[in-house]
């Protein structure tokens, strides 16, 4: 997922609706004036706000890498959902980029898990059902995942 | 690797106010969005507010508008949260959470985030 960097957006257009501050903070799809008296309204597809804030500026939309869909657009209160694409995830201790997940297990260890967005496929022994959690091996045998069904976003 | 510690958490009486630190070390945390997660006995993680990276604003939940207030310290690596006119629902532990990389405010519990131990309100009469 590409993060574009924070920046104030550009004085509000006349035909951006504006609206009062409540106990200082703007509502969601907003961000607050500079002199803190109007909430100005992010721009769709631009820039959003998802909570009660203060932000001098909304926060600039995503855009999914290559390799990633695009599983709803950014709204002025949510950002975009970007997915890994299919035989593809993205691990949580690693949220940089979609990797390809395996082809099949280690030899003498079976398939119980399927590739998903999220999730490599899971490998446990024979005979002692523990988690196979090393390296690609050289060798694998010819057990083939099947793609994950997509469920909830990578994030 | 990233380590923060959570303080100022105890017990106060409901109307009571406190302020809650977060300190990191292993990282500088000037250019890294910054929250503040609780967890109420029994009950899931709830996002708390944020801090935009660059100082550029703050987040809130419904739940605290208008009577917490989030803000860092740079210069000594903090966040804090304080907390005015306390009541007994805001009783939980509060965690203090970062980012592994530079993004938008944290706001929801999933992801690769670093998490504190946690430190514990109780609004008590």
């Known amino acids: 997922i590409t993060q574009q960097d924070l920046a104030p957006q550009q004085r509000a257009a006349p035909q951006q609706k504006r609206s009062s501050p409540s106990e200082g903070l703007c509502p969601p799809g907003h961000h607050i004036s500079e002199d803190g008296r109007d909430c100005i309204s992010c721009k769709y597809g631009q820039d959003y706000s998802t909570h009660w804030n203060d932000l001098l500026f909304c926060l600039r939309c995503t855009r999914c890498d290559s390799g990633e869909v695009e599983l709803s657009p950014c709204t002025t209160t949510r950002n975009t959902v970007c997915q890994c694409e299919e035989g593809t995830f993205r691990e949580e201790d690693s949220p940089e980029m979609c990797r390809k997940c395996r082809t099949g297990c280690p030899r003498g260890m079976v398939k119980v898990g399927d590739c998903t967005p999220w999730s490599d496929i899971e490998c446990v022994h024979k005979e002692s059902g523990t988690k196979h959690s090393g390296e690609v091996p050289a060798v694998e045998e010819t057990v083939t995942s099947s793609p994950g069904t997509p469920a909830s976003p990578c994030s | 690797e990233v380590q923060l510690l959570e303080s100022g958490g105890g017990k106060v009486q409901p109307g009571g106010s406190l302020r809650l630190s977060c300190a990191a070390s292993g990282r500088s945390i000037s250019n890294y969005a910054m929250s503040w997660f609780r967890q109420a006995p029994g009950k899931g993680l709830e996002f708390v507010s944020a801090?935009?990276?660059?100082?550029?604003?703050?987040y809130y939940a419904d739940s605290v508008k208008g009577r917490f207030t989030i803000s860092r310290d740079n210069s000594k690596n903090t966040l804090y949260l304080q907390m005015n006119s306390l009541r007994a629902e805001d009783t939980a532990v509060y965690y203090c959470?970062?980012?592994?990389?530079?993004?938008?405010?944290?706001?929801?519990?999933?992801?690769?985030?670093?998490w504190g131990q946690g430190t514990l309100v109780t609004v008590s009469s």
């Open positions: 959470v970062v980012a592994r990389t530079p993004e938008t405010p944290i706001t929801s519990a999933r992801g690769a985030n670093y």
């Open positions: 801090s935009v990276w660059n100082n550029g604003g703050n």
